[in-house]
């Protein structure tokens, strides 16, 4: 398994991840956002709500 060198993002990238943690993937020369639960998107900019549908009558 190839090891990936990671560190925190620089101050230059403050605010890059809207709802998540910014990680600097050194070997890939990329900033990466690790999103909080409920958020998605490159910069954790999209909120998604998982709606659990109640069981329909035929399953009751």
């Amino acid at each position: 398994v190839a090891q990936v060198s990671i560190t925190k993002c620089s101050s230059d990238m403050n605010g890059y991840c809207l709802h998540g943690q910014c990680i600097y993937l050194v070997d890939m020369s990329q900033n990466y956002c690790r999103c909080e639960v409920g958020y998605t998107g490159v910069r954790c900019e999209h909120f998604f709500l998982t709606v659990h549908q109640p069981l329909s009558k035929e399953y009751v």
Partner: antibody, heavy 116, light 106 residues
Framework: QDQLVQSGAEVKKPGASVKVSCKAS????????IQWVRQAPGQGLEWMGR????????KYREKFEGRVTITADTSTNTAYMELSSLRSEDTAVYYC?????????WGQGTLVTVSS | DIQMTQSPSSLSASVGDRVTITCKAS??????IAWYQQKPGQAPRLLIQ???TLQPGVPSRFSGSGSGTDYTFTISSLQPEDIATYYC????????FGGGTKVEIK
């Protein structure tokens, strides 16, 4: 593949304004920051400022504050840099640079000549 | 603003020589420094980022080191195609370029 295509060369008179465009293809500018860098003939590289196209936030180098305006139109995936009150020392190649999802990725540059 | 002092501003060396360029930051930049090569009429080319990480396709004769405020860029064996101007860039807090080093062949 990913590209930043800048507008063509401009010749302006002292005191005028110039607006340089930077159109992205192959990626969404909302996923990045767009930086602007300039280089006067025979001189070094100078960072001017940047925009966060997703939120519209801008940061400028102090010496350009009040004279430069960086904007972005996410519907056309294009960033802009407008410099006003031009003087001869503003003659330079202006570059847009993507950062964020890729460390640095440069446009081809736009030559702006300020001459009376 | 963070200032980046790059030295020397120019140097002349023979093919095969070891070439060293330094950049000193006005404050700790936490290893967030990149090195660029620029040839006349071309956009800068990224060689190294995060102090020492070589970009894909960049020859191993190029290297970088340092920490805190002091950083070094080295060409272990100068080649004719290395004739260019080299710039450091800090990206810890916004961005600042060093003044550049013009490398020529003796």
């Amino acid at each position: 593949q990913d590209q930043l295509v800048q507008s063509g060369a401009e010749v302006k008179k002292p005191g005028a304004s110039v607006k340089v465009s930077c159109k992205a293809s192959g990626f969404n500018i909302k996923d990045t920051y767009i930086q602007w860098v300039r280089q006067a003939p025979g001189q070094g590289l100078e960072w001017m400022g940047r925009i966060d196209p997703l939120r519209g936030n801008t940061k400028y180098r102090e010496k350009f504050e009040g004279r430069v305006t960086i904007t972005a139109d996410t519907s056309t995936n294009t960033a802009y840099m407008e410099l006003s009150s031009l003087r001869s020392e503003d003659t330079a190649v202006y570059y847009c640079v993507r950062s964020g999802t890729l460390f640095d990725f440069w446009g081809q540059g736009t030559l702006v000549t300020v001459s009376s | 603003d963070i200032q980046m002092t790059q030295s020397p501003s120019s140097l002349s060396a023979s093919v095969g020589d070891r070439v060293t360029i330094t950049c000193k930051a006005s404050q700790d930049i936490h290893k967030y420094i990149a090195w660029y090569q620029q040839k006349p009429g071309q956009a800068p080319r990224l060689l190294i980022q995060y102090t020492s990480t070589l970009q894909p396709g960049v020859p191993s004769r190029f290297s970088g080191s340092g920490s805190g405020t002091d950083y070094t860029f080295t060409i272990s064996s100068l080649q004719p195609e290395d004739i260019a101007t080299y710039y450091c860039l800090q990206y810890d807090n916004l961005r600042t370029f060093g003044g550049g080093t013009k490398v020529e062949i003796k």
